[in-house]
Interface confidence: low
């Protein structure tokens, strides 16, 4: 990977006035032992509300690639495969918590910081507003 | 709130031989200000694939409170506002990171932890196995 | 720390083979199910091949049975995909995954190697 040059002003591990830090062990643990990766892997396609999936790259982020959905229709699939405008095709989107290294560059430094992301499409109801 | 004892075995935050760990800022930023949380808070109830939230809380994990997704019906919704079984309810499934206090109850201490949650769910074109 | 880093992509002619090989490092790799995934250019993420732990059972999405075949080596870390009768249509971003649920939020992937197949 890439070797990121650090950072002359980043904080020592040791300072106590760091604001509001804590000491973080990133040897991840993963409680997702029974799940069968198949299984969802291919709901992006066979979904009446289909997306593609686009890489979101950022190395100073933790975890540094994100996967973001993206609706490919603005309608919805219907029973004949053709797209139905009557429905509408929306992103599911969750707030994350991700590290980011603060200041840039610092190997051992980071902050949370909370984005949104789109994790895939469902299929809705439009709100139709009736002029009077 | 609820006052957690400290555990006795915390290991110290100026502990430079604590595994693979790094300082960690919780000052949350948010990215997400130009958002409306109220546009999609209502997709729940009006996707073909609808589903209820569950509140999912550990007072030993940061974010100690997580909304976890549950499809209402096996089957989707159809224009009639009936259940069509032909179609299958499925959810969306998405890792996420999440910090777990490592010793138990330490307050400057913790680890990444990555757990599967259900963000919402989608309709999908069931796969038919064929007998031969 | 997790790598995976691909390599043997190419051009080539349609009709022609390329094998790919995915070197990986940092996890137990022989615990894990791996994946190859490809992303055509502007299309969507496709899952390609599955292999199980020991390597006894492999599932291929239906556009490449037949055509692909994908192996490891678990004393070696390593992954591979041997391409055949390769198609304008499987042009795209090859990436190795480590056993999780797609789409894949933690960054277990390489760089990806690129896949051109054209006359």
């Known amino acids: 990977g890439i070797t990121i040059p650090r950072n002359p002003g980043c904080p020592n591990s040791e300072d106590k006035n760091f604001p509001r830090t804590v000491m973080v062990n990133l040897n991840i643990h993963n409680r997702n032992t029974n799940t069968n990766p198949k299984r969802s892997s291919d709901y992006y396609n066979r979904s009446t509300s289909p997306w593609n999936l686009h890489r979101n790259e950022d190395p100073e982020r933790y975890p540094s690639v994100i996967w973001e959905a993206k609706c490919r229709h603005l309608g919805c699939i219907n029973a004949d495969g053709n797209v139905d405008y009557h429905m509408n095709s929306v992103p599911i989107q969750q707030e994350i918590l991700v590290l980011r290294r603060e200041p840039p560059h610092c190997p051992n430094s980071f902050r949370l910081e909370k984005i949104l992301v789109s994790v895939g499409c469902t299929c809705v109801t439009p709100i139709v507003h009736h002029v009077a | 709130g609820i006052t957690i004892p400290r555990n006795p075995g915390c290991p110290n935050s100026e502990d430079k031989n604590f595994p693979r760990t790094v300082m960690v800022n919780l000052n949350i930023h948010n990215r997400n200000t130009n958002t409306n949380p109220k546009r999609s808070s209502d997709y729940y109830n009006r996707s073909t694939s609808p589903w209820n939230l569950h509140r999912n809380e550990d007072p030993e994990r940061y974010p100690s409170v997580i909304w976890e997704a549950k499809c209402r019906h096996l089957g989707c919704i159809n224009a009639d506002g009936n259940v069509d079984y032909h179609m299958n309810s499925v959810p969306i499934q998405q890792e996420i990171l999440v910090l777990r206090r490592e010793p138990p109850h330490c307050p400057n201490s913790f680890r990444l932890e990555k757990i599967l949650v259900s963000v919402g769910c989608t309709c999908v074109t069931p796969i038919v196995h064929h007998v031969a | 720390e997790v790598q995976l880093v691909e390599s043997g992509g190419g051009l080539v002619l349609p009709g022609g083979s390329l094998r790919l090989s995915c070197a990986a490092s940092g996890f137990t790799f022989s615990s894990y199910s791996m994946y190859w995934v490809r992303q055509a250019p502007g299309k969507g993420l496709e899952w390609v091949a599955e292999?199980?732990?020991?390597?006894?059972?492999?599932y291929y999405v239906d556009s490449v049975k037949g055509r692909f075949t994908i192996s490891r080596d678990n004393a070696k870390n390593s992954l591979y995909l041997q391409m055949n009768s390769l198609r304008a249509e499987d042009t795209a971003v090859y990436y190795c995954?480590?056993?999780?649920?797609?789409?894949?939020?933690?960054?277990?992937w390489g760089q990806g190697t690129l896949v051109t197949v054209s006359s």
């Open positions: 995954a480590k056993g999780e649920i797609l789409p894949l939020y933690f960054d277990y």
């Open positions: 292999i199980k732990q020991d390597g006894s059972e492999q």
